[in-house]
Interface confidence: low
């Protein structure tokens, strides 16, 4: 039996700059029941606060609701582990909510096969920003990637589309089925997970419709 090992703050992420969650990895518990508490202060303030919500985001986490989230302050966060034999504190993590945004994936992905006058076909991929992001007001500037592969291919081909919410993919094989996904990243933030997969078959005998 021994004091607990040093916990480590694994990451902090915000879906929308309005709330955020921090997760930690507990160290060894020293073979004893161990309590974990997350405390934080804000840069330039003397007060230290305890995590407002240990439940919402699951085990070893702290959820900061709107009420506790401010984007103009840097949070200094530590996790403390305590058992009968002693205690141990993580290294502090400095968090600027603006820089930890990991949004939901883009939505409404649509795929359409088009044909140019020279008979070259292309796939027109379109999507919308994630619901929660207020892109119109400039509160968020979102960048996008799409990835696609033929159904049987080993590798994905990734295209960065910048701020565009549409992309034309040339060089696709007729008769092949292609899978497409999108993801997004705000300025200074993290890529979302890849969104729902959509598929489309490139026709063998595509004829131009009037």
């Amino acid at each position: 039996q021994s004091p607990p090992g040093k916990p480590e703050i694994h990451k902090c992420r915000s879906p929308d700059k309005e709330t955020f969650t921090c997760w930690w990895n507990p160290g060894s518990d020293g073979g004893l029941p161990t309590n974990y508490s997350l405390t934080y202060s804000k840069e330039g303030e003397k007060n230290t606060y305890e995590c407002p919500d240990y439940k919402t985001s699951g085990p070893n986490s702290c959820f900061f609701s709107k009420q506790y989230t401010s984007i103009w302050k840097i949070y200094i966060i530590t996790v403390n582990a305590t058992n009968e034999m002693g205690s141990s504190t993580s290294d502090p993590l400095y968090v600027d909510v603006t820089y930890i945004v990991e949004p939901e994936p883009p939505r409404n992905l649509t795929l359409e096969v088009k044909q140019l006058k020279d008979k070259k076909t292309y796939l027109w991929v379109k999507w919308l920003p994630p619901t929660i992001t207020d892109v119109k007001t400039g509160w968020f500037t979102m960048e996008y990637e799409i990835r696609l592969k033929s159904e049987e291919a080993d590798e994905w081909e990734i295209h960065f589309t910048g701020h565009q919410t549409q992309f034309k993919v040339f060089d696709l094989y007729p008769g092949q089925k292609y899978l497409v996904q999108t993801r997004c990243k705000p300025d200074h933030g993290y890529w979302s997970r890849w969104g729902q997969e959509k598929s489309i078959e490139i026709p063998n005998d595509f004829t131009l419709k009037d």
């Epitope: 049987e152 291919a153 081909e157 094989y173």
Partner: antibody, heavy 118, light 112 residues
């Protein structure tokens, strides 16, 4: 796993022909173009041509048109490159390559050395 | 035919140092569909070439992120941010915008 396995080394006389094979596995053979590229000793790479295994449609480098013939056997998932009227400057390692989405070569055979010597 | 000119011909690099290879094409590699089909291959000693970068800047699967490609039109660059011993070999640029597809003459990279 995508694999392209080529036939063994050949020694040929000037004026004769050589036929190199490239057996594909690990994917649907008819779905991707096969390209042929050669590399003379200590030299760079030279594209010979490409073939669509689904319908045997070919594109050739003009330099090899009339001398190179690209064919496929769909039943055995094998592509062939035949080069006729061989001369000493045709001595090279010949590679087959498979496209990824279109025309860059993500997968290559191990190469076949063809030596043309009298 | 489109002529691809690579410089330098050879490069001797200390491990951990950066390296840069230039590739210039005799005409624009922008296809009528807007894509630029400029690719980079590495041929390690005694091996077949392997794809590193396709369409100017897209790293092929499994290629370490120390490799990056950039450029547009007729001027392109392959950069290795920190050269490792396993990076030795001959680097080729290649264009597949125009038929016939053509390759650069190659740049031999060795370790000091």
């Amino acid at each position: 796993e995508v694999q392209l396995v080529q036939s063994g080394a050949e020694v040929k006389k000037p004026g004769s022909s050589v036929k190199v094979s490239c057996k594909a596995s690990g994917y649907t053979f008819t779905s991707y173009w096969i390209h042929w590229v050669r590399q003379a000793p200590g030299q760079g790479l030279e594209w010979i041509g490409e073939i669509d295994p689904s319908d045997s449609y070919t594109n050739y480098n003009q330099k090899f048109k009339g001398r190179a013939t690209l064919t496929v056997d769909k039943s055995s998932s094998t592509a062939y490159m035949e080069l006729s009227s061989l001369r000493s400057e045709d001595t090279a390692v010949y590679y087959c390559g498979r496209s990824f989405f279109t025309n860059w070569f993500a997968y290559w055979g191990q190469g076949t050395l063809v030596t043309v010597s009298s | 035919d489109v002529v691809m000119t690579q410089t330098p011909l050879s490069l001797s690099v200390t491990p951990g140092q950066p390296a840069s290879i230039s590739c210039r094409s005799s005409q624009s590699l922008v296809h009528s569909n807007g894509n630029t089909y400029l690719h980079w291959y590495l041929q390690k000693p005694g091996q077949s070439p392997q794809l590193l970068i396709y369409k100017v800047s897209n790293r092929f699967s499994g290629v370490p992120d120390r490799f990056s490609g950039s450029g547009s039109g007729t001027d392109f660059t392959l950069k290795i941010s920190r050269v490792e011993a396993e990076d030795v070999g001959v680097y080729f640029c290649s264009q597949s915008t125009h038929v016939p597809f053509t390759f650069g003459g190659g740049t031999k990279v060795e370790i000091k």
